[in-house]
Structure formats: C-alpha cells, structure tokens
C-alpha cells in the first residue's frame, strides 16, 4: 500500500514539475527590468527564452521574437536546450510511469516490469528535473552577471548633461518556477525511484521452500505473502516460483501474488 | 468617435478648492489611462499626472503632490481633478488627455480654465 | 526630472519653405527592448488643445499630412514641416514619454515671414 502511495504520489509531484517546466520555459519574464534605483519609466521591459516584450503605462505590450538563431548568444542557445531536454525527458518519463503505476492493470504484466518500469521514468524525472533546475541557474548566473557589468557603467556620460542609462535586467517570475518546477519534477523522480524498490521481488520471493510432511505440505511464502495449505501423495521438496507458483508435477497449485493487487 | 469632455470655467478664491472634470466617450473607459497637463497663460505645457482606471494607480509629477488629487469614477466615465487651497499660482487651463499606445496622448479634452482670484 | 530643450524658441518661415525645430533631452529616450524613442511631437493652435502630430519619434500620427516628419535617436531629435502651410502656424512642442515624469520641451512658435 505504502509502495503505491509512494509510487502515485511521485508521478503527482512529478506531473506538477513538468508542467510547470513547460510552462517556466513559454514564459516572457525571465528576465524583467530593474526598477529599484532607476529612474522611473513610462516602458517596462522583459524578456524570455523565445521572445522580448515591452509594457507601456498606456496598457499597450508589444513582443518580439528572436527571430535570429546564429545571432543569440551561446547560453541562451545552452538555456533552451537544457530546458527543451527537461520537457522531453519528463513528457517520456510520465509515459512510462503511467504503464507503471501498480493501481493500472495491464495485461498480465509482471512486477518485475513494473519495478524496471517505475525506476526508468524515475530517473528520467530525477535528470528532467536537474537539466530545468541547470538551465535557469545558467540563465540567473547570466543576468547576474550583466546585471553588475551594466550596473559599473549605468550611466555612460554623453557630453556635458546628456545621459544614457543603461537598461538593467533582473530576475524574472519564469526563473522561480523553473526552479521549484525543476525540484518537483526531481522530488518525483526520487520518490519514484523509492517505490521501484519496494515493488521489485526480493530473491528470497522467488525461493520459498514448500515442506510437506506426509500427505500434508504447507507452502510459507516470506514478505507477508499467505501460506497455502495443499493436499496430496508427493512429498518432495518443491519450489515454488514467482506468479502461477504450480508445482512441478502440475499437483499442487497456489495463489498467484496478482490476486492480491 | 474618442471624445473627452471637461467641465467649465471657474472663479475662485485663494484658499478655495476646485473640481474639474473629464467626461469620456467613444472608448472603453477602463482600459486608458487618463493624464493632466496644466497651461499656465502664455506658458508652456506642464504634465501634472495620470491615472489608470483600470488598475487604480495614480502617478504624479513632483511639483503635483499633496494638494492634487486625481481620481475618478468609472460608473459615468469620468475622471477628476481636485485642487484644494488654490493659490494665485494655479490660475491656468488644466487639460485632460487620453494615454494611448506609444505613451501618446491621442485625444485631448477642450480645456478648463480655472482663475483664483480675490 | 528628463529636461527637453527645444530650439529655436521662435521660427519664420516663407510659406512653402522647409521648417525645422529640434529638441534634445538630458536623458536617451531610447527603449532597447522595442528599439523605439519615445518622443512625441505636438501642435497647439491658440485657444485650442494640443493635437499630436507623431509619436515613437517619427511614426506619424493617422490624419496628419506627410509635410509633417520626425527623425532623430537617442537625445537628439528634430520636427519638419517641408512646405509650410498657413494652418502650421502654431507652437510645436516635443515630449519625453519614457521617463515619469512625462515632461515637455518649452515650445517653438512657428510663424510665417
């Protein structure tokens, strides 16, 4: 039970990440206009991974796409790969967990898939979200960066009064949600990771020894899985296997470990 | 068609206080902003200050602050000047003007002289 | 506060010859996200309100005649009439609307020699 609360919770947490992934990535302010100790301007200005956008106080918001590919700067180039691989990796990684869940029954799939399964869209969750958190960290380490540089010569002297303030470009609201987004998707990525070990069968699942003493044998099955009691002539040792548990002689046959899901 | 409407001229004494006001038609009240620009005679133009009807911010030029209050109601479309203990200084026509997208301001009211005089 | 200087204070122009007022601003009113300069440009006729003329520096406002242009970047910017009109006699004036507040140069008086 604790495994597909484990399990489901993760994919939740992780499905919450990779939305707001997607959504941290189409948005315009990651980078917004400095505004404290500047002069106070009638135009804000902010900008994005895909576009730069300009507010007027009249209301009036004009976007302009990077229509360039060659002529944008390497990091942005490297912030919207890393953000890209995030959404690719995530959208694949809840593909995946969702044939994994334990709730969702498909066909007669073992749970050894499943575990597999569960730990594959956990990892890939775990990088999604380290490749989002990487890419706005790039992206901030960027505006930090040219936030000190135009800040050491804001106002670049023209000649007597004439003045050129430089425009200054602070964080913006899509780099907090990149970063939350980015530690969801890698919170569900650990979780699901968790889960896959409580899913996959121990090897001592697999071996259970089945002792009969005469014309009675009582199958104990560790892990907390129900003893079965079965009745007949053979009394040789027998192991019983993971799923139909028949024994060899086609005899005795037990519960599957599916009829407890 | 955009039309901003004022109030008429008025007399007042020193110490007085004066409300002017700006009628708007043709346009969707709330989504422009609404600034006024004062006309001292024989003078130049003098911004005083704007509001945004729609998201209630009202910003003012320094020499505009405490006995200038901009308001407005957008029940009647309206937008308001208030001037309290008028001075001699203030007689001047007060102008209202729409702000319109490249921070221009496309649509001028008539103009309202306000003279304060004892 | 952004100080707007416009010159000359007053113009005589023949009819039909070309009129040039220019106006400069302490600060560049130069926008580098859009790339535009935010300077508007104004007539006001007397007795009457101000009418806009161009705004963005030299995008014309819809209805004003084409002998009206504006040119200019950054701190430097300049209105033309290129063939006066007896109708252009008025005061010109320029406004920085970039930076609160939204200042005006004092005026050019433009009249007919």
């Known amino acids: 039970m604790a495994v597909t609360a484990c399990q489901g919770l993760g994919f939740v947490v992780s499905l919450i990440g990779i939305a707001g992934i997607i959504a941290a990535t189409c948005m315009d302010q990651w980078s917004t206009q400095d505004l404290y100790n500047n002069p106070v301007t009638a135009v804000f200005n902010y900008q994005g991974l895909w576009r730069s956008c300009v507010r007027e106080s009249s209301g009036f918001t004009e976007c302009r796409g990077y229509f360039t590919l060659l002529g944008l700067p390497a990091m942005l180039q490297a912030v919207r790969a890393l953000m890209i691989v995030g959404i690719v990796l995530g959208a694949i990684g809840l593909l995946v967990s969702i044939f994994a869940l334990k709730c969702i029954r498909i066909g007669s799939m073992e749970d050894s898939a499943k575990a597999n399964m569960t730990l594959t869209s956990g990892i890939m969750f775990i990088v999604s979200g380290l490749c989002a958190i990487a890419g706005v960290s790039v992206f901030a380490n960027m505006l930090v960066t040219n936030f000190w540089m135009s800040t050491a010569n804001m106002y670049t002297g023209m000649g007597g009064m004439v003045q050129t303030v430089q425009t200054r470009y602070t964080f913006g609201a899509a780099l907090f949600v990149g970063w939350v987004a980015g530690g969801l998707t890698l919170i569900g990525g650990v979780m699901m990771c968790i889960a896959c070990r409580g899913l996959a069968p121990e090897e001592t699942n697999y071996k259970a020894v089945s002792y009969h003493a005469s014309g009675h044998s009582v199958a104990y099955k560790p892990g907390g899985f129900k003893a079965s009691t079965g009745f007949g002539s053979n009394t040789k040792n027998k192991k019983i296997y993971d799923g139909g548990a028949r024994t060899e002689d086609e005899v005795q046959s037990y519960p599957s470990k599916h009829d407890y899901v | 068609q955009i039309q901003l409407v004022q109030s008429g001229s008025e007399l007042k004494k020193p110490g007085a206080s004066v409300k002017v006001s700006c009628k708007a038609s043709g346009y969707t009240f709330t989504n422009y902003g609404i600034n006024w620009v004062r006309q001292a005679p024989g003078q130049g133009l003098e911004w005083m200050g704007w509001i945004n009807p729609n998201t209630g911010e009202t910003t003012y030029a320094e020499g505009f602050t405490g006995r200038f209050v901009l308001s407005w109601d957008t029940s009647v479309s309206t937008a308001y000047l208030q001037i309290s203990s008028l001075k001699a200084e203030d007689t001047a026509v007060y102008f209202c003007?729409?702000?319109?997208?490249?921070?221009?301001?496309?649509?001028w009211g008539q103009g309202t002289l306000v003279t304060v005089s004892s | 506060d952004i100080v707007m200087t416009q010159s000359p204070d007053s113009l005589a122009v023949s009819l039909g010859e070309r009129a040039t007022i220019n106006c400069k601003s302490s600060q560049s009113l130069l926008n580098s996200g859009n790339q535009r300069n935010y300077l508007t440009w104004y007539q006001q006729k007397p007795g009457q309100p101000p009418k806009l003329l161009i705004y963005?520096?030299?995008t014309r406002e819809s209805g004003v005649p084409d002998r009206f242009s504006g040119s200019g970047s950054g701190t430097d910017f300049t209105l033309t009439i290129s063939s006066l009109q007896a109708e252009d006699v008025a005061v010109y004036y320029c406004q920085n609307a970039y930076y609160y507040p939204l200042t005006f140069g004092g005026g050019t008086k433009v009249e007919i020699k």
């Open positions: 963005w520096a030299s």
């Open positions: 003007a729409r702000l319109y997208y490249g921070n221009r301001f496309d649509s």
